[in-house]
Amino acid sequence: QSPIFGPQDVSSIEGNSVSITCYYPDTSVNRHTRKYWCRQGANGYCATLISSNGYLSKEYSGRASLINFPENSTFVINIAHLTQEDTGSYKCGLGTTNRGLFFDVSLEVSQVPEFPNDTHVYTKDIGRTVTIECRFKEGNAHSKKSLCKKRGEACEVVIDSTEYVDPSYKDRAILFMKGTSRDIFYVNISHLIPSDAGLYVCQAGEGPSADKNNADLQVLEPEPELLYKDLRSSVTFECDLGREVANDAKYLCRKNKETCDVIINTLGKRDPAFEGRILLTPRDDNGRFSVLITGLRKEDAGHYQCGAHSSGLPQEGWPVQAWQLFVNEESTIPNSRSVVKGVTGGSVAIVCPYNPKESSSLKYWCHWEADENGRCPVLVGTQALVQEGYEGRLALFDQPGSGAYTVILNQLTTQDSGFYWCLTDGDSRWRTTIELQVAEATKKPDLEVTPQNATAVIGETFTISCHYPCKFYSQEKYWCKWSNDGCHILPSHDEGARQSSVSCDQSSQIVSMTLNPVKKEDEGWYWCGVKEGQVYGETTAIYVAVEERTRGSPHINPTDANARAKDAPEEEAMESSVREDENKANLDPRLFADEREIQNAGDQAQENRASGNAGSAGGQSGSSK
């Protein structure tokens, strides 16, 4: 008895495709050895047609694939554009030669079936509507019209012109005539189900003078599209159900036993297992929509179906589209932290991996919002202005060539808790989801800036100190000036006469920043932070207000700005999140499923880009040593 198992008999018709799954024992050797599909010849020799080593025969070129799924101990042979010549005996097997472990498979490809001469073949998908056309002669214009379905020798009436409708076709079948036509009637059957398939006869009149037409109805179950994705990557299900369901609620469900469990629908239902990593995006007014899932897990593999129904739930006889998702555990996407914890008033540094081959791609960070179908407005990007409400506390540090960029968010409040996505305008698989959990702080922050009321006077010298604990002693300390396109680390060199310097007193564990002399453009947010090489750690922020030397002149009180860093009153946070920012890049990740849209958004962001070069501190008067 062969330990390999698969379908012994596979049958199909010309032009179709088959997908043959072969199961093998779960051993390390089997998982990694060569998989093959060969055709048995009369001489006993089995000629390889395709193998996992990359071999593809000429007759299979462009129409076949072999995919190994080591985590399931299966491999799948897909063969498209079948012809009758494909009929024959095959083996699916494992081993370096075609004599190893194998299973015999018989493939039979038939011609498209013949029907009586006057038979019209109608091919429709499940859930769709078929219109059967029935011609008749003028003599039967006033006679009874009917459509019946053949069951063996009998023909059971489906509908007739006396308004009879078979109960199983109730509310689905209508018989009608169009306009002034006197020689044709029509029967519509909607919400088709597989058992509707078969031979139908439509008839006008009775007895020998009756006019009859044969119709063969084929109801196709959607053939699942096979999707192969890496662990931790993302997948987009593009669903196009047609205009007839444009106004019905849409859903994506996952098959589980005999049910299909809704993952997300347009009525607000969402499976908790997909919280923070799913978006449903309407595409147009014709019922098209897409569902994007990020951070793929092993358990996400399976059969998915999208559909439409007013209930937002799967219903038999409504159009569906199907996929089978395979999740490959041998992923190129590195494993990164899925939960990051912070405390109020503190900061987090989130490392976002991206495809190292695409170091020039635009990087973005967005906040997943649960409302309706889920959305992810961009908060910061390499060429997108920081969203209002995040000024002075959010920056993206690109580290070209490292395959990662870092997003730092400080002045944390509990309202920052939630899910965030790292994404680029390049390889769409590299989208990672991070859950940020912000707890109430129970102790003083590690980094503290003095004075907290930072007001500098133009032309004078201004020094601000950042106190750090001993645990940061060996780490690099830095000050940077925040701007809308990043936080530019202050240069570690003298700027001549202006005498800017940062000195670190090891005994008192202070890193201080001096502005000398203060200029108007020095006003703004400054960050004190620690890092080790490219790895960023804790940061804290302070707003430095700049005022004229003249006595009695009004100045901006920085207290409010710095109070937000500590307390972030809810009213202010709420108001800032509602306000419109005319200048912000309109990067709406509801469009992310369509890669062109993120590109367009990136272009637009470039137009809106704030002047200033990331990583350069030109024109600033701060410096650090």
């Epitope: 198992f5 379908p7 012994q8 008999d9 596979v10 049958s11 199909s12 018709i13 179709n16 495709s17 088959v18 997908s19 043959i20 199961y23 399931n72 299966t74 189900i193 597989p194 058992s195 084929q218 196709l220 179950e221 053939e223 699942p224 098959k255 589980n256 036993k257 005999e258 399976g302 059969h303 038999e316």
Partner: nanobody, 126 residues
Framework: QVQLVESGGGWVQTGGSLRLSCAAS????????MGWFRQTPGKEREFVAA??????????YYTDSAKGRFTISRDNAKNTVYLQMNSLKPEDTAVYYC?????????????????WGQGTQVTVSS
């Protein structure tokens, strides 16, 4: 849930034939594996054959002991699956069950308790 009703079992002599039927109701079974299993007293249910179909492609699976003797088939319009058993042997004596499950994974495994028929007895005597 799918309701399954088997019929066609009975007594037959060695070498004889039987045709088992499994009628499904409750929902169409086009997206299912429809399988036949058998059980003899004191033993586990064992896989005999299964069928699945996608569009106009059909896939038939058999256990080694059924190959060449048993044929599984279906009638879509009737939502029915058949098992034609030829060259029957005394060791084929068992209660034959029809089962359904979504078309995912190995057709020999993991059929849910609520997707089984009540069974039909097949007795082969020498």
């Amino acid at each position: 849930q799918v309701q399954l009703v088997e019929s066609g079992g009975g007594w037959v002599q060695t070498g004889g034939s039987l045709r088992l039927s499994c009628a499904a109701s409750g929902r169409t079974v086009s997206s299912y594996y429809m399988g036949w299993f058998r059980q003899t007293p004191g033993k586990e249910r064992e896989f005999v054959a299964a069928i699945s179909w996608v569009g106009s492609s059909t896939y038939k699976y058999y256990t080694d002991s059924a190959k060449g003797r048993f044929t599984i088939s279906r009638d879509n319009a009737k939502n029915t699956v058949y098992l034609q058993m030829n060259s029957l042997k005394p060791e084929d004596t068992a209660v034959y069950y029809c089962a359904a499950r979504p078309r995912v994974g190995d057709p020999r495994s993991r059929y849910d308790d609520d997707n089984w028929g009540q069974g039909t007895q097949v007795t082969v005597s020498s």
